[in-house]
Interface confidence: low
Amino acid sequence: ASVIYVYVQDYRSPFIASVSDQHGVVYITENKNKTVVIPCLGSISNLNVSLCARYPEKRFVPDGNRISWDSKKGFTIPSYMISYAGMVFCEAKINDESYQSIMYIVVVVGYRIYDVVLSPSHGIELSVGEKLVLNCTARTELNVGIDFNWEYPSSKHQHKKLVNRDLKTQSGSEMKKFLSTLTIDGVTRSDQGLYTCAASSGLMTKKNSTFVRVHEKPFVAFGSGMESLVEATVGERVRIPAKYLGYPPPEIKWYKNGIPLESNHTIKAGHVLTIMEVSERDTGNYTVILTNPISKEKQSHVVSLVVYVP
């Protein structure tokens, strides 16, 4: 079905009411490359039309380039030129008489999302029954509204909670922050997998993902490749890593011939036992004991260090 508009020239009413359903409101983005059309259509094609913006009062006239008026389209102008204004209207001069269109409220809408950050961003491990809390923060330009969408393995989770809120930014800041927090009170094995948060401003979407690992219960074990014999020559630096699997990360304690080792300037006893300059007296049996901080389960492993004198 085609629609025909009949224009009747009327010098007493040169502007005609817009047929647009967004009559009276113009939406703009503060983007130097975008133009906006104020739909003040004319019943006369060769009018001298200017655009008035307020406040403060400013007048824009067609420049034969990016600012123009067309009776069938309206007044076209780069968005950023009127982004300061609360309202605009078109004005025509006929025989020294001024005629004004209706007022159009200017609504500045942003769309650009700078980034979406998940926290924690990686290495998330839990055991069954623990609480998972994932924060998704979107940073955007001003005047943006954000919709968050989460995708995760067990979307029908009964104990899931989603909270979205705007974050306060410093006054004068050129950006907005939005936060969506996903909480699952008691995770199960089916909650293991990829968690994706997508932030959408309508015209732009950005997303980020992280992997969540869920263990049946807290545990600790030595990983493959844990050495039982280390050989070194006097003066070398010796590194003996405690290769483990476990959740949560275990407490690690090193012993030499049954005596606890403490870190000092010659030896570092962390998840890697480091002897800065090995000597003959460092020869012996080193025991590493892993303790799970929740279950208190312990695992031990003995490494024999042999030091050769050249």
């Epitope: 490359n33 999302i113 959408s200 015209l203 732009m204 979407t205 950005k206």
Partner: antibody
């Protein structure tokens, strides 16, 4: 299974009209911006129109403004493209695509529109 | 409108080769760029968004880089199933525009 299926394509004379539909399934249709993208035979991709999740914002490429209308019915998980005053240069496969303007992450298989006398 | 210039328009490579496609924007588009793969008779498929982020489920041999006006898409080791046309797309400013495409063939 996330799926988009277009329908409504066909042969039409220049100046004629067609209404394309896209049926969505497997995701929350009402949460996503939806788009139409077209591809003329043997040519590249061209974005046609976008409509935001609640139909608050609608965007068109210049060549179809005033002739094409994008709309959606979230209750039926459906996207539409009403095409009027069709021209020979509108001949193309029309794809329905999910996602915002940032990235079209799910595409339908397309429906062919041929404008010829 | 922002013009996206893709090069080359076609290229022939052998299985196992490293393949690089470039995309140049007529204006600064920050990192607002996507890459798509379209196999003959199929719909396009999103591979990379935000210039360098791999879409979920896409093999790690595909990668993207660049910002501003110059962008690169790389296949580290070409596989027979990678035969397709590849498109870049900017989403910095409306209208959204695609590159002309790069048709990739096996030698």
């Amino acid at each position: 299974q996330v799926n988009l299926r277009e329908s409504g394509g066909g042969l039409v004379k220049p100046g004629g009209s067609l209404r394309l539909s896209c049926a969505a399934s497997g995701f929350t249709f009402g949460s996503y911006t939806m788009n139409w993208v077209r591809q003329a035979p043997g040519k590249g991709l061209e974005w046609v129109a976008s409509i935001t999740s609640g139909s608050s914002y609608i965007f068109y490429t210049d060549s179809v403004k005033g002739r094409f209308t994008i709309s959606r019915d979230n209750s039926r998980s459906s996207l539409f493209l009403q095409m009027n005053s069709l021209r020979a240069e509108d001949t193309a496969i029309y794809y329905c695509a999910r996602g915002s303007a940032s990235a079209f992450d799910i595409w339908g298989q397309g429906t062919m529109v041929t404008v010829s006398s | 409108d922002i013009q996206m210039t893709q090069s080359p328009s076609s290229l022939s490579a052998s299985v196992g080769d490293r393949v690089t496609i470039t995309c140049k924007a007529s204006d600064d588009i920050i990192n607002y760029l996507n890459w798509y793969q379209q196999k003959p008779g199929e719909a396009p498929k999103l591979l990379i968004y935000d210039a360098s982020i791999l879409e979920t489920g896409v093999p790690s041999r595909f990668s993207g880089s660049g910002s501003g006006t110059d962008f690169t898409f790389t296949i580290s080791s070409l596989q027979p199933e990678d035969i397709a046309t590849y498109y870049c797309q900017q989403y910095d400013i409306l209208p959204l525009t695609f590159g002309g495409g790069t048709k990739l063939e096996i030698k």
